[in-house]
Interface confidence: medium
């Protein structure tokens, strides 16, 4: 990722605040969704509504299909349940780490992001540690700025994430989703 | 032209508090990171805090974490370190900076904090 | 911790010299390194970002490398004003954001 240097300013697609504006208005969106296909109300989800343009509810529909995709990997599944949330800011940011540590950067590894986040706040509710939720969303947030905004705007924004999942092909790029994070998630357990 | 400005460093007496401030121009603190690093007579650098306004996650070394407050004012683009129960090792130059991706690429001038009795 | 041990913490070298400093890190860090070149009395200034990648504005005769876990700044022809202290930084992830080598001087043999 070209990493330094001043951003585009103003109000486009690529410019740093709208990049972040709408990651997370998707990740608000997608955590949410989530959250509500467990079933049972959640009121600590119950942040702020935002009122999204067609761009971003189109994004937001594709990562609820992803989202839907990833949740039938049984593998993924169980290594995510397998997670230790003693220390979950060490394992948010290692398995994030990791899952770009080689420096590649494509749109799969960003909804991988957003996956693990959503089920790091799930694992939240459940254990009951409320507090986490709006701290998870956080720590995604922090990583998406300090590691991938760059990458993001050079592909001209989120809109980016439609053309690499709108092809016929979508549910194998979501295989190799579950794949990065799947990865990321065994290299974590052998160093934890 | 982005500008960090630092202030607000001077003499303390071990046990006193001081409020550093950060001033930033040419880029909205908002969507960056602001570090406070600093450097004691003929050392190394040392990372102290950091900020993520967007989120409002912090962070700290464990040398000042209880003691040490990193904090932002958007409207003002302005980021501060509270210092408080101050001890003579926490006299050095204290720089803020921001990052972007794996590096801080724009820093202050720095501001002298001596800590003596 | 992560931990940035960087070498040697000092060297003497005449202009034109080719200087080599490294540092490396106590596991795995990705490529997510920087360095920095501080003069007496001023701020860091940023070389190097992301393990190779040259910060606007610095001159080619900086470059950075990557080898595991061991990271390299090389000036492959040093000018006066290249004598300084330079360091390596790490920020791999935020459990410790960030983490400075010692700091190597280099001086004017």
């Known amino acids: 990722m070209d990493g330094s240097g001043e951003q585009p300013r103003g109000g486009g697609p690529t410019s740093s605040e709208q990049i972040m504006k709408t990651g997370a208005l998707l990740l608000q969106g997608f955590i949410q969704d989530r959250a509500g296909r467990m079933g049972g109300e959640a009121p600590e989800l119950a942040l702020d509504p935002v009122p999204q343009d067609a761009s971003t509810k189109k994004l937001s529909e594709c990562l609820k299909r992803i989202g839907d995709e990833l949740d039938s990997n049984m593998e993924l599944q169980r290594m995510i349940a397998a997670v230790d949330t003693d220390s979950p800011r060490e394992v948010f940011f290692r398995v994030a780490a990791d899952m770009f540590s080689d420096g590649n950067f494509n749109w799969g590894r960003v909804v991988a992001l957003f996956y693990f986040a959503s089920k790091l706040v799930l694992k939240a509710l459940c254990t009951k540690v409320p507090e986490l939720i709006r701290t998870i969303m956080g720590w995604t947030l922090d990583f998406l700025r300090e590691r991938l905004l760059g990458w993001i705007q050079d592909q001209g924004g989120w809109d980016g994430l439609l053309s690499y999942f709108g092809t016929p092909t979508w549910q194998t790029v979501t295989i190799f989703v579950a794949g990065v994070l799947t990865a990321s998630l065994t290299i974590w357990k052998k160093m934890g | 032209e982005v500008q960090l400005v630092e202030s607000g460093g001077g003499l303390v007496q071990p046990g006193g508090s001081l409020r550093l401030s950060c001033a930033a121009s040419g880029f909205n603190l908002y969507y960056s990171s602001i570090h406070w690093v600093r450097q004691a007579p003929g050392k190394g650098l040392e990372w102290v805090a950091s900020?993520?306004?967007?989120?409002?996650?912090?962070y700290y070394a464990d040398s000042v974490k209880g003691r040490f407050t990193i904090s932002a004012d958007t409207s003002k683009n302005t980021a501060y370190l509270q210092m408080n129960s101050l001890r003579a090792e926490d006299t050095a130059v204290y720089y803020c900076a921001r990052s972007y991706g794996y590096a801080m690429d724009y820093w202050g001038q720095g501001t002298l904090v001596t800590v003596s009795s | 911790d992560i931990q940035m041990t960087q070498s040697p913490s000092s060297l003497s070298a005449s202009v034109g010299d080719r200087v080599t400093i490294t540092c490396r890190a106590s596991?795995?860090?990705?490529?997510?390194v920087a360095w920095y070149q501080q003069k007496p009395g001023k701020a860091p200034k940023l070389l190097i970002y992301?393990?190779?990648s040259l910060y606007s504005g610095v001159p080619s005769r900086f470059s950075g490398s990557r080898s595991g876990t061991d990271f390299t700044l090389t000036i492959s022809s040093l000018q006066p004003e290249d004598f300084a202290t330079y360091y390596c930084q790490q920020s791999y992830y935020w459990v410790s954001p960030f983490t400075f080598g010692q700091g190597t001087k280099v001086e004017i043999k």
């Open positions: 900020i993520y306004p967007y989120s409002g996650s912090t």
């Open positions: 596991q795995s860090v990705s490529s997510a």
């Open positions: 992301s393990a190779s």
